[in-house]
Interface confidence: medium
């Protein structure tokens, strides 16, 4: 909604003419004091809609708020409106005239209220007085609304000075009403139902004896009324409930069910709403997916969680390599499915102290008569690396051959390193990495095998040292995401008798 000129407040000269335009992407109209003044509404050549309000020969009586609203405002669209305020200073008019019922102000509890005496000129100074005592009260004044504050049960008048004459407003009477605050709660037996099932909604009020229930629900639109049942639940505090029951739900019963509770002695009220969805058939839907490969660490516990939405309650089965799983008596495997909200579920598979044999393909299947869903993943069990052997051999050609064998999951990396100064190795001197050197001093060959039955990799790395001219400390280190392991061996030249 776009208002031109934009405002939000205008001060007009008496007898002048003022044009206000409101434009939007849907038909609009102007409202003043809930009345619709004469205006020109049109669709423009650019496809927008506008309404032009022309105020001619304005007087003090034109002072007030004007709203631009959508002209078929129903339901929540009512709140979508734009306000501007116009002052027309009129020395002949003191306070704006009031309807007699607006002079009686009913207050419940200690709440802020407004004594709505308004003037046509925003420059005027206005004071509030208790009628009996002619002393101004220190209450903030808003020229567009009046005096805003907390008032006792007394009689009040507003005063202002126009030129050299003092002007009094009508008398305002403030009355306090004791009504306990309304506390409404609305709940449904189920907010998701299949067609043919029943809808039951309860609206409960605490601590008030005289209340009026008013329901709005989707069936009202087609003129089919449902008779609610009022239920008195005696006790301390007292509770009154209204129950709306639809025995056989239809798809058109989907929507918002609103319970409006009002107290007849005042305008006190509260409103609560709940959404109900009627579905043709039940459903099961995954809310989160899992990576295709899930990792567990050997001898650690691992919980795998699947979140899904379903109605009605589904059965849940877990499978490993196409065989159904169940809670094990040894407590190595725990299955649980929790209902975390009306239609949301969390199914968990917990593997306690994971074993290598628990690696494999897992599937969770959630199903009922109307629908089913399944989620599969591969469980990989990670095993720390171990160097199983580091051996050396001396073929006749004078080479030294070192063979390092180890296992782990995921696949380990092999690093060979050497250290020549035995006294300072490896604490004080960093080892030198070895590999296939261009000088052909060393040659490295690594073979990897995956052992299906053990679900882990075996690495065999062979290091050929062409000639060794002094004692060397050689280390083979295996490393993967689970950690590292190493072994060392001391290699001596063929010609050198070496004692450790």
């Amino acid at each position: 909604l776009v208002i031109t000129p934009p405002g939000p407040e205008f001060v007009l000269n008496i007898s002048s003419t003022f044009v206000l335009t409101c434009s939007s992407s849907a038909p609009v109209m102007w409202e003043q004091m809930s009345q619709v003044p004469w205006q020109e509404a049109a669709m423009n050549q650019d496809g927008t809609f506008s309404s032009v309000l022309t105020l001619t020969n304005v007087t003090g009586g034109d002072t007030g708020e004007y709203f631009c609203v959508y002209n078929n405002s129903l339901g929540p669209e009512l709140s979508e409106r734009k306000r501007i305020y116009i002052f027309v200073p009129d020395p002949t008019m003191g306070f704006l005239p009031m309807d007699s019922e607006d002079l009686f102000i009913f207050v419940t509890d200690v709440t802020e209220t407004t004594i709505p005496c308004r003037v046509t000129d925003p420059q005027l100074e206005v004071t509030l007085h208790e009628k009996k005592v002619d002393i101004p009260l220190h209450v903030p004044y808003d020229h567009q609304r009046g005096f805003i504050g907390t008032f006792e049960d007394k009689t009040y008048i507003c005063k202002t000075t126009i030129g050299d004459r003092e002007v009094d407003s009508d008398t305002y009477y403030v009355y306090s009403l004791q009504v306990s605050s309304i506390n409404v709660s609305v709940n449904a037996v189920q907010t998701v139902v299949r067609q043919g099932e029943s809808i039951t909604i309860r609206c409960i009020v605490m601590g008030n004896d005289v209340v009026n229930f008013q329901w709005t629900y989707p069936r009202m639109k087609s003129g089919r009324l449902v008779e609610p049942v009022t239920d008195y639940l005696f006790g301390v505090p007292s509770r009154i409930g209204s129950i709306l029951h639809i025995p056989t739900a239809e798809l058109s019963d989907s929507g918002t069910y609103t319970c409006n509770v009002s107290v007849s002695v005042n305008d006190h009220g509260d409103e609560k709403a709940i959404n109900v969805t009627v579905i043709e058939n039940g459903y099961v839907r995954l809310l989160e997916t899992l990576e295709d490969v899930q990792i567990a660490e050997l001898h650690r516990s691992r919980t795998l969680q699947v979140v899904f939405e379903a109605y009605p309650t589904p059965s849940v089965l877990w499978f490993k390599d196409n065989r159904t799983l169940g809670d094990s008596s040894a407590g190595e495997l725990v299955l649980s499915t929790r209902n975390v909200s009306e239609t949301r579920y969390v199914s968990e598979l917990t593997l306690v102290r994971v074993k290598v044999s628990e690696a494999g393909y897992y599937t969770m299947r959630a199903f009922h008569a109307d629908d089913q869903v399944q989620l599969s993943f591969k469980l990989q069990v990670n095993v720390p690396v171990r160097v199983l052997e580091l051996s050396e051999s001396h073929p006749a050609n004078g080479e030294q051959i070192l063979r390092c064998r180890g296992r782990g999951m995921p696949q380990p990396n092999v690093t060979w390193s050497t250290c020549r100064d035995l006294k300072r190795c490896p604490r004080k001197l960093s080892p030198t990495p070895l590999g296939n050197s261009s000088k052909e001093e060393s040659q490295l060959e690594t073979n990897v095998t995956f052992w299906e039955e053990d679900q882990e990799y075996e690495v065999v790395s062979t290091l050929r040292l062409r000639h060794v001219d002094q004692p060397l400390s050689v280390r083979c280190m295996l490393q993967n995401s689970m950690g590292r392991d190493s072994q060392e061996v001391t290699v001596v030249p063929h010609s050198l008798p070496f004692k450790v």
Epitope: S24, S25, A26, G47, S50, N72, E80
Partner: nanobody, 118 residues
Amino acid sequence: EVQLVESGGGTVQAGDSLRLSCTASGRTFSTYTMGWFRQAPGKERVVVAVNTWNNFTVHQPSVKGRFTMSRDNTKNSIYLQMDSLKPEDTAVYYCAASAKGTARYDYWGQGTQVTVSS
């Protein structure tokens, strides 16, 4: 961001019919006011028909009774059924979208040519 794609234009004889379609991307289609506009050679672009987010449909007087605009929120689409076409209906027809609460059309299609020969 809304993308609009028109289709259904072409060349027809006076008195024939054509149906234009416009499909929008985006999940909040129902909250937009949608409009059909046209621009004849050498003239300004003018509105033909509008369907608002709160479900008013308004047609320009010159096409009333001959053109019917409709909308299908489930398909994110609007349509313009053009019957009893006249040579003066020859123009590029554009589909446009205006967000709720604004007073302008921020999103436009590329246009589709309609030619009516006598």
